[in-house]
């Protein structure tokens, strides 16, 4: 009986540790996408509607803030699209890029952790164009560090929650 009690206590401890594991899945806020063709920081994301969720991490001022030291898997998916109903592309040659950046407040510094994308020729003869970028990686993050997303050509972003999103989840502690 004691073994059983010990076992269930262990399960409970494991479960509560798992429930405390930080994670975030943030989806683009379509009502507040910046315009332009230059590289811009995307600051408007949902954290609590649709597919978007956050636990034991903080979302503030457009940045995902780490609350616990650890090794995290970071990911971002960015979709670009253009349909002729919205007008013509002013240029048919495009650089479609995403940058996942880490900013440290304690030692003021910024590093690009991941980038992805391509140069594209989106011909004016086509009715519809689409391009998707997915990046992911495993990083050591410290409490207080901030993750942000920058993209080129934000006015071409696909505003759907299943198209443009980023997130993180803690995989293990730092030994």
């Amino acid at each position: 009986e004691k073994a059983m009690v010990d076992g269930s206590w262990l399960d409970l401890a494991k479960r509560s540790k798992l429930e405390a594991q930080p994670f975030a899945h943030l989806t683009i806020n379509a009502t507040d996408i910046p315009s332009g063709s230059h590289k811009v920081s995307l600051s408007s994301w949902y954290h609590d509607r649709g597919w978007a969720k956050i636990s034991n991490m903080t979302f503030s001022n457009g940045k995902l803030i780490v609350n616990q030291d650890g090794f995290y898997y970071l990911y971002a998916n960015i979709c670009f699209r253009h349909h002729e109903t919205s007008g013509d592309l002013a240029t048919e040659y495009l650089q479609l890029m995403v940058y996942v950046t880490k900013t440290s407040i304690k030692i003021p510094s910024s590093h690009t952790l991941m980038k992805g994308g391509s140069t594209k020729y989106w011909s004016g003869n086509s009715e519809f164009h689409f391009y998707s970028i997915n990046v992911g990686g495993f990083f050591k993050l410290r409490s207080g560090e901030e993750i942000s997303i920058e993209v080129s050509n934000p006015s071409l972003l696909d505003p759907d929650q299943d198209a443009t999103y980023f997130g993180a989840f803690k995989v293990r502690d730092i030994d």
Epitope: S35, G36, S37, H82, E84, T85, S86, G87, D88, L89, A90, T91, E92, L94, N153, S155, L156
Partner: antibody, heavy 126, light 103 residues
């Protein structure tokens, strides 16, 4: 204030060419696209083409492809539309119009024509 | 190629009347629809863009609505200076125009 001032009326014989100018003032010419639209007597407005005044990129209606040339002189803040091999059905009022999208902030030519020239009557008659 | 169809082609109304012009697209165009006013010998004027946004300087008696393939331009109280031909437009396609006259 924003103004587009077009050149005066022209009369041409069939087979000839015409070049219409559109001088812009009151804004940074290079930051916007200029469209050319025409209206033949009793007809609807008809889009002909655009030029991105910043980089010189152009797009034309299939109907005018091969007959139309649109250029710009950024120093003079002026756009030009030349139509060749004129026929009687090209008799129309030709307008230039500014696209509302500021190319510094946007990558899409939106086809919202927020300012127009006064129009240039081109008559093609033998 | 998208085709824009306006109705009616002409209308006659009294000063102060509410006037409605309809524009249909041959396929869905979301809200990418603009309205222009044309008066003889004058530069055309953008009234409404993006189906319902009023262009700066345009009187508030003009309004636009609709999305998808059906749109309307409404003049809430017709004024003598509103005598003109009105055109709807989506990118490269214009409607055939609606001529508005005073009774």
């Amino acid at each position: 204030q924003v103004q587009l001032v077009q050149s005066g009326a022209e009369v041409r014989k069939p087979g000839a060419s015409v070049k219409v100018s559109c001088k812009a003032s009151g804004y940074d010419f290079s930051n916007y696209a200029i469209h050319w639209v025409r209206q033949a007597p009793g007809q609807r407005l008809e889009w002909m083409g655009w030029i991105n005044a910043g980089n010189g990129n152009t797009k034309f209606s299939q109907k005018f492809q091969g007959r139309i040339t649109v250029t710009r002189d950024t120093a003079a803040s002026t756009a030009y539309m030349e139509l060749r091999s004129l026929r009687s059905e090209d008799t129309a009022v030709y307008y230039c119009a500014r696209d509302s999208s500021n190319m510094v902030r946007a990558i899409i030519i939106a086809y919202y024509f927020d300012y127009w020239g006064q129009g240039t009557l081109v008559t093609v008659s033998s | 190629e998208i085709v824009m169809t306006q109705s009616p082609s002409s209308l006659s109304a009294s000063v102060g009347d509410r006037v409605t012009i309809t524009c249909r697209a041959s396929q869905s165009i979301s809200r990418y629809l603009n309205w222009y006013q044309l008066k003889p010998g004058k530069a055309p004027r953008l009234l409404i863009y993006g189906a319902s946004s009023l262009q700066s300087g345009v009187p508030s008696r003009f309004s636009g609505s609709g999305s998808g393939a059906e749109f309307t331009l409404t003049i809430s109280s017709l004024q003598p200076e509103d005598i003109a031909t009105y055109y709807c437009q989506h990118t490269r396609a214009f409607g055939q125009g609606t001529k508005v006259e005073i009774k």
